[in-house]
């Protein structure tokens, strides 16, 4: 029989990205394995991950039910092979996470620029409404289908010949600016969800600049 | 088709090890767990523990933790249980029993046909 | 460890009848459940997994639910080749646990 060196796991992660959520926790196993569990404050400890020697577990599909509810988390440690627990009187050890309201500690995803159109001195800026794994009646819902007008997006605009920019914001998934004829301008946008106090705004989407493929002109 | 073919079966005298073996074939060896299950004459079934075949990491019930040694030979798609210091109590059927898919993950959803350990002075 | 009392411990009924076992949790173990039949001689076959779900090919005769930690097993029209014993089994919790069983024969 071996050494008793089951460890509790530490450094319990949650790691999401437009409702994308895995748990990671620390440390790498030796002679030990792991089970993940996850519970709504009022629910079941469900467990995933079973007798895993990886030190992460994916919980999109648990938490994606309902992305508005509370979730905790909970890492069991195991001995594996003839290694004895350190757990007392047969408890097994576990650690437990802090807890997770996707709604509000997911973060936004980097945005992409879909399309944007010139028609004279106005341009139709369209930002891509990215698919979540939110599903309601078997289809995937989109981020503002999840969010609606609780997610706003900044577009930032200048023109190719100079530096300075300029910002407006949607509660939509476009924008229709003014610019100067005969100018050539570049985009970015910005996810924001205005509501929040933490991960209120996305990375900065690729710049997208006219001239280029994405553009149509129109007199 | 999917199967497990376990060995014959053994006869042991009190304090000896028995080793069971499990051959796996009809899909990726490696992709499934594989668990331990007894069951004495007469009574219900015991989960003994599990082999994860890709690294060979074991899981044991605590009942049997120190007696019990699951090993796989993954050249063969095989599997093994050794278990030692026998006892008439251990006498039983031994089965091992594949972990199912993702979604099932611990339905044991193919069986080998069982091996019966006798143990008997 | 998690016990899984199953009841009754053995039942008998006619061809055609509704026959439903139970098995009860010790705690809370979410839909972590699966049922097994298991028939002289042989090794137990799945039958229901995650406490609802139909394994490949079993006859739609044999559903499972759940409420709490309250499980329940039914053949909805007992069928001569359903003489068995019946198992559930729970994988919420280290160790695997699995219910005492319940025999089912033809009066």
């Known amino acids: 029989s071996g050494t008793t060196n089951t460890v509790a796991a530490y450094n319990l992660t949650w790691k999401s990205t437009n409702f994308k959520t895995i748990l990671e926790w620390e440390p790498k196993p030796v002679n030990q394995v792991y089970t993940v569990q996850i519970s709504t404050k009022s629910g079941d400890w469900k467990s995933k991950c079973f007798y895993t020697t990886d030190t992460e577990c994916d919980l999109t599909d648990e938490i994606v039910k309902d992305v508005k509810q509370t979730y905790l988390a909970r890492v069991f440690s195991y001995p594996a092979g003839n290694v004895e627990s350190t757990g007392s009187a047969g408890e097994p050890l576990f650690t437990n996470a802090r807890k997770f309201l996707p709604y509000r500690d997911t973060k936004l995803g980097q945005p992409t620029i879909q399309s944007f159109e010139q028609v004279g001195t106005k341009v139709n800026v369209t930002v891509e409404d990215e698919r979540t794994l939110v599903r309601r009646n078997n289809t995937f819902l989109s981020l503002r289908d999840v969010f609606g007008k609780d997610l706003i997006y900044t577009l930032y605009y200048w023109k190719s010949s100079s530096s300075g920019k300029k910002t407006a914001k949607t509660n939509t998934n476009e924008f229709l600016i003014d610019v100067d004829k005969g100018e050539n301008y570049c985009f970015s946008v910005q996810a924001v969800i205005p509501s929040r106090t933490v991960n209120r705004k996305s990375t900065d989407s690729p710049v997208e600049c006219m001239g280029q493929e994405k553009g149509e002109f129109r007199e | 088709q999917v199967q497990l073919v376990q060995s014959g079966a053994e006869v042991k005298k009190p304090g000896a090890s028995v080793k069971v073996s499990c051959k796996a074939s009809?899909?990726?060896?490696?992709?499934?767990?594989m668990h331990w299950v007894r069951q004495a004459p007469g009574q219900g079934l015991e989960w003994m523990g599990i082999i994860n075949p890709s690294g060979g990491i074991t899981v044991y019930a605590q009942k049997f933790q120190g007696r019990v040694t699951m090993t796989r030979d993954t050249s063969t798609s095989t599997v093994y249980m050794e278990l030692s210091s026998l006892r008439s109590e251990d006498t039983a059927v031994y089965y091992c029993?594949?972990?199912?898919?993702?979604?099932?993950?611990?339905?044991?959803?193919?069986w080998g046909q069982g091996t019966m350990v006798t143990v008997s002075s | 460890d998690i016990q899984m009392t199953q009841s009754p411990s053995s039942l008998s009924a006619s061809v055609g009848d509704r026959v439903t076992i139970t098995c009860q949790a010790s705690?809370?173990?979410?839909?972590?459940l699966n049922w097994y039949q298991q028939k002289p001689g042989k090794a137990p076959k799945l039958l229901i997994y995650d406490a609802s779900n139909l394994e490949t090919g079993v006859p739609s005769r044999f559903s499972g639910s759940r409420s709490g930690t309250d499980f329940t097993f039914t053949i909805s029209s007992l069928q001569p080749e359903d003489i068995a014993t019946y198992y559930c089994?729970?994988?919420?919790?280290?160790?695997?646990?699995f219910g005492g069983g319940t025999k089912v024969e033809i009066k």
């Open positions: 029993a594949r972990g199912g898919s993702k979604v099932a993950a611990l339905a044991f959803d193919i």
């Open positions: 705690q809370d173990i979410s839909n972590s």
């Open positions: 009809g899909y990726t060896f490696a992709n499934y767990y």
């Open positions: 089994q729970q994988y919420n919790f280290h160790p695997l646990t």
